[in-house]
């Protein structure tokens, strides 16, 4: 997260760290007791590595009573996700067992009504991604509030040049932005999950390259079918 601040500890009990061989790889969001939603591209280079999900964490390194690392029983990328596009960049991870819920571990309601969030709406994005252009990784969860950007502006040639479909949304990126390592994490508007940070090699913090988020409402049928 660029231009953000440290989050209040455990105030986002839905927040997950998707880990590869014990190290933070991507963000994720607990959407059901046994399911974490993240980004498909996160596992592209995972190959034979061990994928796990950390819940109930604020610090990645310090012991915390609510922290627990779960093995992944099943990883379900969206069937239409592809390495070279940002489209359908969703991944559902089934935990090896139902998460132990409590004040620091709780699923987040997700948007089912397929309607765009109004431009200008302030939404919260959180993650353990890099906090500066030098690539410094934080130990504790960071967050930032970002205004939603209208799709027409996001589709301008100097922004994302027509790449933003109806299944994607954008948020402003003027020094405050999601960045590498935040992919798969939640964009929360009004207490509801609206978007998932897409994973790509997008430049962060440049106002002409807005953050791109997958609209979960557009994938309600797929999410429901996997969780069923």
């Amino acid at each position: 997260i660029l231009g953000g601040r440290e989050a209040e500890a455990h105030a986002r009990p839905y927040m997950a760290s998707v880990q590869l061989n014990g190290a933070h790889l991507c963000g994720g969001v607990l959407v059901a007791e046994q399911w974490v939603l993240s980004a498909a591209h996160c596992l592209e280079d995972a190959a034979d590595g061990k994928v796990q999900v950390l819940l109930g964490a604020h610090s990645l390194s310090q012991p915390e009573p609510s922290k627990r690392l779960y093995d992944v029983l099943r990883a379900v990328p969206h069937p239409d996700s592809q390495p070279d596009t940002i489209d359908h960049d969703l991944l559902l991870l089934q935990l090896s067992e139902k998460a132990t819920l409590g004040p620091a571990v709780r699923p987040l309601p997700w948007q089912r009504v397929d309607r765009d969030v109004a431009p200008g709406t302030l939404c919260d994005v959180a993650g353990w991604g890099i906090v500066n252009h030098a690539g410094r990784r934080p130990d504790s969860l960071q967050h930032v509030l970002l205004p939603v950007l209208d799709r027409a502006t996001c589709n301008r040639r100097t922004h994302h040049d027509g790449a933003i479909t109806e299944r994607l949304m954008c948020a402003e990126s003027n020094r405050r932005d999601s960045c590498k390592g935040d992919s798969g994490g939640p964009l929360v508007c009004g207490g509801v999950l609206e978007g998932v940070v897409t994973s790509g090699s997008r430049v962060c913090g440049n106002r002409k390259k807005p953050g791109i988020y997958t609209r979960v409402a557009s994938y309600a049928a797929w999410i429901d079918s996997v969780l069923a």
């Epitope: 027409a152 502006t153 589709n155 301008r156 040639r157 100097t158 040049d161 027509g162």
Partner: antibody
């Protein structure tokens, strides 16, 4: 299939006004800026300006700012170009073109002739 | 405003010829996001322009591989490696990095 269809061109006297329409189909109208470009007979392409179909924000080439105005009817997925105080040198084919990707989609153009 | 100057203004060539059109801008067209929004359009008489190349060197969908773009800073080139009968048209360069966006004056490619 993305389609842009202009209409409203024709013969108009100097000093007169004309409103051109650009009807869009095959995509969500509010997801892309609309631009207007003109081409005088035998001449090159000239950018007039653009409009954001969500906010209505406009940007005009300084040469057109005083006399030309963009507007929208999102319920009809249509953009409009209102041209006032027309002169002989405004005689041209007028195109609308969607921005994103680049100017990949254009209307067929509508000819405006300013003559007495 | 940024001026784009194309050369030549017109040229005569035969089918199979290699054709090069240059476009020079009056100032750099590198955008503040680091990208260069230099595009090439082809226009045939009585028709709307067609996008050929975007961001200097990227071919638009369906554009034949004989069309290529190159350049940086202020100097750009469109090359047609082997001219085909359907390529006789007018070509325009365009910069979208700075408002007002501008077109070159055009290069007409005629049959020899």
């Amino acid at each position: 299939e993305v389609q842009l269809v202009e209409s409203g061109g024709g013969l108009v006297q100097p000093g007169g006004s004309l409103r051109l329409s650009c009807a869009a189909s095959g995509y969500t109208f509010t997801d892309y800026y609309m631009n207007w470009v003109r081409q005088a007979p035998g001449k090159g392409l000239e950018w007039i300006g653009d409009i954001n179909p969500v906010t209505g924000d406009t940007d005009y080439n300084a040469d057109f700012k005083r006399r030309f105005t963009f507007s929208l009817d999102t319920s009809k997925s249509t953009a409009y170009l209102q041209m006032n105080s027309l002169r002989a040198e405004d005689t041209a084919v007028y195109y609308c073109t969607r921005e994103g990707p680049s100017f990949a989609y254009w209307g067929q153009g509508t000819l405006v002739t300013v003559s007495s | 405003d940024i001026q784009l100057t194309q050369s030549p203004s017109s040229l005569s060539a035969s089918v199979g010829d290699r054709v090069t059109i240059t476009c020079r801008s009056s100032q750099t067209i590198v955008h503040d996001n680091g990208d260069t929004y230099l595009e090439w359009y082809q226009q045939k008489p009585g028709k709307a322009p067609n996008l050929l190349i975007y961001k200097v060197s990227n071919r638009w969908s369906g554009v034949p591989s004989r069309f290529s773009g190159s350049g940086s800073g202020t100097d750009f080139t469109l090359t047609i490696s082997s001219l085909q009968p359907e390529d006789f048209a007018t070509y325009y360069c365009f910069q979208g990095s700075h408002v007002p966006v501008t077109f070159g004056q055009g290069t007409k490619v005629e049959i020899k």
